[in-house]
């Protein structure tokens, strides 16, 4: 008799997770010398071990400490990227500028970016049918926990200038439920951190709107500014030029030294 | 050394035309946006005109309609069409390569400028 | 079009420090740059992106950028640095401040 299967609203776990997982660990730790120690192995059973046989609503991010000490890792405090929104011309842009980092150029995020999971309770399977969505299942979910433990501990590691790069495309400039508005800024330590300097990107070269005035940056100013670190606000005007470097990292007009 | 040199600057009369040149040398010409600055006699800056290495052209409004910038990168060459030309457009006129990031631009070189004057 | 001020003179003893500002509505969200312009020359770039100096501009050459004001610095001004000085952003169009004349007393 087929067991009876919890359905949730959102798509399942992605398919060939464990081997994309392990696969990714092995490609990250050859890529970054510093990292040559990490037991990939051992990397994958602690990942497993915070979500296999746990109801898939009731995931804590203790479950991840395990991950996470496996996963420690410094990056340059002051070379920080944070993004909203803009996940892609983020990564796009440390690519290029190599000595600032984001989330997802960590190992950790480059484990889980753009992927699924979750298991079930009781049993060691992986759900690959469904898996609990944010908004319409539950908040504690594999995925979601995850990323709000690692962007945490991100963003308390943070330190000087921090930046976030923002899509001044969408109607929510700052949206304070996205994982920037609702975990990372909180995270920020007023202690190490003096400011955070948003880079809003524009839509197009023809929109010379100060997007820096928007009224959802003067609600992230705000809570920036309540928390005692210091807020600045550049607009970007240039998604042309900011991909054509991208994509051209030698390119002699990017990097130019004068 | 990177150098930029115009020419084809003169007097005109109103409502008459003229076209600069600009000759690039010392840097991959086709790697770089380019642009038109001018000064009118005792006046401050005035960009004029852009074009970007695939070609998209920008103009200030003062000047939108009349002229018309191109470049032919196998000449390393930027040019500056001026019609309709009117007596507020008598400047010297700078041409100037646009460096940057990311994140911004600016003119890190500029030629040493060809004089234009519109009278009658 | 963001409108940038600055003011038509500044005049400053040699070896003191000259600070041009230029203004303009929440300048600060933009990125500045200074140019020097000598009687008869080009303009030459001295500062990028509110603060970073290209290379061969002398060290006593700073800037600064927020709220409505940036800011070149010339400290410990030579005779040499009297010039014009313009500073110039961007917001879809690229705009140049009127320009301040550095007389070096």
């Known amino acids: 008799v087929p067991r009876w299967r919890q359905q949730w609203s959102g798509p399942g776990t992605t398919k060939r997770f464990p081997e994309t997982v392990l696969a990714r660990c092995v490609k990250y730790t050859e890529i970054h010398p510093e990292m040559r120690h990490v037991d990939c192995q051992s990397v994958w059973d602690a990942f497993k071990g915070a979500f296999i046989s746990k109801h898939p609503c009731n995931i804590t991010e203790e479950d991840y400490q395990p991950l996470m000490k496996l996963g420690t890792q410094t990056v340059p405090c002051n070379k920080i990227l944070l993004w909203s929104r803009i996940k892609d011309l983020a990564h796009q842009f440390t690519q290029v500028q190599r000595d600032m980092f984001t989330l997802e150029d960590t190992l950790l995020g480059y484990l889980a970016d753009d992927l699924t999971w979750c298991g079930e309770f009781n049993t060691s399977k992986i759900n690959y049918q469904s898996c609990p969505d944010w908004r319409k299942d539950c908040s504690n979910n594999p995925v979601s926990v995850f990323w709000k433990t690692v962007s945490r501990r991100f963003a308390e590691a943070a330190c000087d200038v921090v930046h976030v790069m923002l899509n001044g495309s969408r109607s929510k400039i700052f949206d304070k439920n996205s994982t920037f508005g609702s975990v990372e800024v909180h995270n920020l330590q007023p202690e190490k951190v003096q400011t955070l300097e948003a880079w809003v990107i524009h839509g197009g070269r023809e929109d010379s709107r100060d997007l820096c005035q928007d009224p959802t940056i003067k609600e992230l100013e705000s809570i920036i500014s309540k928390r005692n670190i210091q807020f600045s606000c550049k607009n970007i005007y240039r998604p042309d030029k900011f991909l054509q470097c991208v994509k051209n990292p030698e390119d002699s007009s990017c990097t130019s030294e004068i | 050394q990177v150098q930029l040199v115009e020419s084809g600057g003169g007097l005109v009369q109103p409502g008459g035309s003229l076209r600069l040149s600009c000759a690039a040398s010392g840097f991959t010409f086709s790697s770089y946006a380019m642009n038109w600055v001018r000064q009118a006699p005792g006046k401050g800056l005035e960009w004029v005109s852009n074009?970007?290495?695939?070609?998209?052209?920008y103009y200030a409004d003062s000047v939108k309609g009349r002229f018309t910038i191109s470049r032919d990168n196998s000449k390393n060459t930027l040019y500056l069409q001026m019609n309709s030309l009117r007596a507020e457009d008598t400047a010297v006129y700078y041409c100037?390569?646009?460096?940057?990031?990311?994140?911004?631009?600016?003119?890190?070189?500029w030629g040493q400028g060809t004089l234009v004057t519109v009278s009658s | 079009d963001i409108e940038l001020t600055q003011p038509p003179s500044v005049s400053v003893a040699p070896g003191q420090t000259a600070r041009i500002s230029c203004s303009g509505d929440?300048?600060?969200?933009?990125?500045v740059s200074w140019y020097q312009q000598k009687p008869g020359q080009a303009p030459v770039l001295v500062i990028y992106?509110?603060?970073n100096r290209p290379s061969g501009i002398p060290e006593r050459f700073s800037g600064s950028n927020s709220g409505n004001t940036a800011t070149l610095t010339i400290s410990g001004t030579q005779a040499e640095d009297e010039a014009d000085y313009y500073c110039q952003s961007y917001n879809g169009t690229y705009v140049f401040g009127g320009g301040t004349k550095l007389t070096v007393l």
């Open positions: 100037a390569r646009e460096d940057g990031s990311y994140m911004t631009d600016y003119f890190a070189y």
């Open positions: 929440n300048i600060g969200h933009y990125y």
């Open positions: 074009i970007q290495r695939v070609g998209s052209t």
């Open positions: 992106s509110d603060s």
